[in-house]
């Protein structure tokens, strides 16, 4: 049950005062008490909680010769660089014997120019693309009203009338600066100025115009670039690998890409020195004086097959009566595709040419017409792919077979 007879006569003869000021201010709170006997340690409370790391100093002055005489104890709490977290109700707390005593409260308040919690940041945006900027400020005193400025021109008639924490910009066609002013009863604070750099939009509709075994012609549609003309576009091609990351949408190719620059217009480029019958991934970005656009997504493309670039090698042809035996080796020159087989042609001096498809074999036995008396018989061989025949070998004369 409540007991009201407990002695609670306070030893405090001086209580903490009040401090109100702007951020960064340094101030001191002071408590004074008069006690008999050994002076107690003075603890400081903020909003009812003991301050464990208080920057306090305690001075004790005896009022008599004897230790049991009265003492004056002064505790000073120093607040350096006042912050919002320092504000609140301050009291001194002492334990005297078996009793607890708490001083009357003093108050620490913050009042000054607005303080920015968030300011607009530099960024790049694509031309004519919406984006948001953030600004947040606080007092005290509240309220804090914001006024946004674009290229130093206010975007509202008065603070608090326009957008506040978030500014929505529907799009820009030139690089611009943005800042915000925070207004309260004490005055105005201006944020940092953010530079919003307008880059070209990502190109669209990257596509193949024509394909050759060793070159691809590609075209694209440029994006808007605001008031800044495009200076060039950059195309990258990289060999596709079945397990490559770009198919999973990874932003960077797994190896050094082949990079080509295109003057614009036209928004078209012939990529040469490619491997035939090879899958590639390509992408394009366009650049203005302000910087490059983002890359397009990787587009998978493939060079077509070509015809073999050289004839089969080491052709030998021998004749034995009405039969001829011909064999050869695969061309040393690039095949430019998948070898589908060989064609063979033979012809006598006064006879029509005979054309044969040998398939993938590299030897054949020919049954010659008649008794084999056809003179000056020659043989030619060519390799072929799906794209067509490669060059024919030089005619090889059929030599008579000599046993042994």
């Amino acid at each position: 049950a409540p007991r009201g007879t407990q002695a609670e006569e306070s030893p405090f003869v001086g209580n903490p005062g009040n401090i109100t000021g702007a951020r960064g201010l340094t101030g001191t709170l002071r408590c004074q008490l008069q006690v008999q006997g050994e002076p107690p340690e003075v603890h400081w409370l903020r909003d009812g909680q003991i301050l464990e790391l208080a920057d306090s100093t305690q001075t004790q002055v005896p009022l008599g010769e004897d230790e049991q005489d009265d003492w004056i104890v002064v505790s000073q709490l120093r607040i350096t660089s006042l912050q919002l977290s320092d504000t609140g109700q301050y009291q001194c707390l002492v334990f005297l014997g078996h009793q607890t005593f708490v001083s009357q409260p003093g108050y620490v308040g913050l009042e000054g120019l607005p303080y920015f919690l968030e300011e607009p940041e530099d960024r790049t945006v694509a031309a004519n693309t919406p984006f948001n900027l953030s600004c947040q400020a606080q007092g005290p005193p509240e309220p804090v009203d914001l006024l946004w400025l674009q290229d130093a021109v206010p975007l509202a008639t008065a603070p608090g009338h326009g957008p506040q924490r978030s500014l929505h910009v529907p799009g820009l066609n030139k690089t611009s600066s943005f800042s915000c002013e925070a207004h309260n009863a004490k005055g105005v604070t201006t944020s940092r100025t953010a530079t919003i750099t307008v880059l070209p939009q990502q190109p669209r509709n990257l596509h193949l115009v024509s394909r050759q075994p060793t070159e691809l012609e590609v075209a694209w549609t440029p994006g808007l670039s605001g008031i800044y003309p495009l200076t060039h576009c950059t195309l990258q091609a990289v060999l596709s690998d079945d397990g490559m990351g770009i198919q999973a949408g990874e932003p960077d190719p797994p190896e050094e890409p082949l990079t080509s620059q295109a003057s614009v217009p036209p928004h078209q480029l012939r990529l040469g020195s490619l491997h035939p019958h090879t899958p590639y991934h390509i992408r394009v970005a366009c650049t203005s004086s302000q910087g490059p656009s983002s890359w397009t997504h990787w587009l998978p493309v493939e060079t077509p097959e070509g015809v073999p670039l050289g004839p089969p090698e080491n052709i030998s042809a021998t004749r034995n009566g009405s039969q001829a035996f011909v064999h050869w080796q695969e061309p040393r020159a690039p095949l430019q595709g998948t070898l589908l087989g060989y064609r063979l042609a033979y012809q006598g001096q006064d006879t029509p040419e005979v054309l044969m498809d040998i398939g993938l074999r590299q030897e054949v036995t020919l049954e010659l017409q008649g008794d084999g008396s056809v003179s000056n018989l020659t043989v030619c061989v060519a390799a072929y792919t799906a794209a067509g025949d490669g060059p024919w070998s030089l005619p090889v004369p059929l030599e008579a077979w000599r046993p042994g």
Partner: antibody, heavy 118, light 112 residues
């Protein structure tokens, strides 16, 4: 003389809310934490939460966070505890108590008996 | 959260006997800055508010008979009643105020 005065009893219907009061006198109200303690019939004491009148800072026992809301009115030196969505489980005696920073003297109200019944 | 455990939950003794009850906390209640153990003992009789007996683990509240003694430090605390009287029939609670408040489950003292 320090006193914490609480109404003797409250009767409310299930599902309703109730605001319990604790009027302080005889000391500097804004300087000391007010705690609220629940005691169901035949059970022990359960700390529910506390409030520092000087700044209205509060702490809650996790168990009562969605049940209780603590407020103060400095002008009348009164602490309040609002209890919401009442059920028979909320039928109990509710004490308010002043915390003297772990020391003495500490003071308790006489308690309010809350009965939740239709 | 600090958990307080009291034992025994009840005990019955004859008048004049000595009684001890225990209270353990899940963490130390000694504040190194104030050099005090933030543990209190309360007595609650039926239909009454809890009454403070001991604070700072061992300091007797004024007006409390000297047969009540508190001891211990850190995490282990004891309340001793040197010679139980009939009016001591009550439930005894320990309470920590080191970090917010937590009560022990109580020890019910009955007189044989």
């Amino acid at each position: 003389q320090v006193q914490l005065q609480q109404p003797g009893a409250e009767l409310v219907k299930p599902g309703a809310s109730v605001q319990l009061s604790c009027k302080a006198s005889g000391y500097t109200f804004i300087s000391f934490w007010i705690n609220w303690v629940k005691q169901r019939p035949g059970q022990g004491l359960e700390w529910m939460g506390n409030i520092f009148p000087g700044s209205s800072s509060t702490n809650y026992n996790e168990k009562f966070k969605s049940k209780a809301t603590l407020t103060v009115d400095k002008s009348s030196s009164t602490a309040y505890m609002q209890l919401s969505s009442l059920t028979s489980e909320d039928s109990a005696v509710y004490f308010c108590a002043r915390d003297y920073y772990g020391g003495s003297p500490d003071y308790w109200g006489q308690g309010t008996t809350l009965t939740v019944s239709s | 959260d600090i958990v307080m455990s009291q034992s025994p939950s009840s005990l019955a003794v004859s008048a004049g006997e000595r009684v001890t009850m225990s209270c353990k906390s899940s963490q130390s209640l000694l504040n190194t800055r104030t050099r005090k153990n933030y543990l209190a003992w309360y007595q609650q009789k039926p239909g009454q508010s809890p009454k403070l007996l001991i604070y700072w683990a061992s300091t007797r509240e004024s007006g409390v008979p000297d047969r009540f003694t508190g001891s211990g430090s850190g995490t282990d605390f004891t309340l001793t009643i040197s010679s139980v009287q009939a009016e001591d029939l009550a439930v005894y609670y320990c309470k920590q105020s080191y970090n917010l408040w937590t009560f022990g489950g109580g020890t019910k003292l009955e007189i044989k």
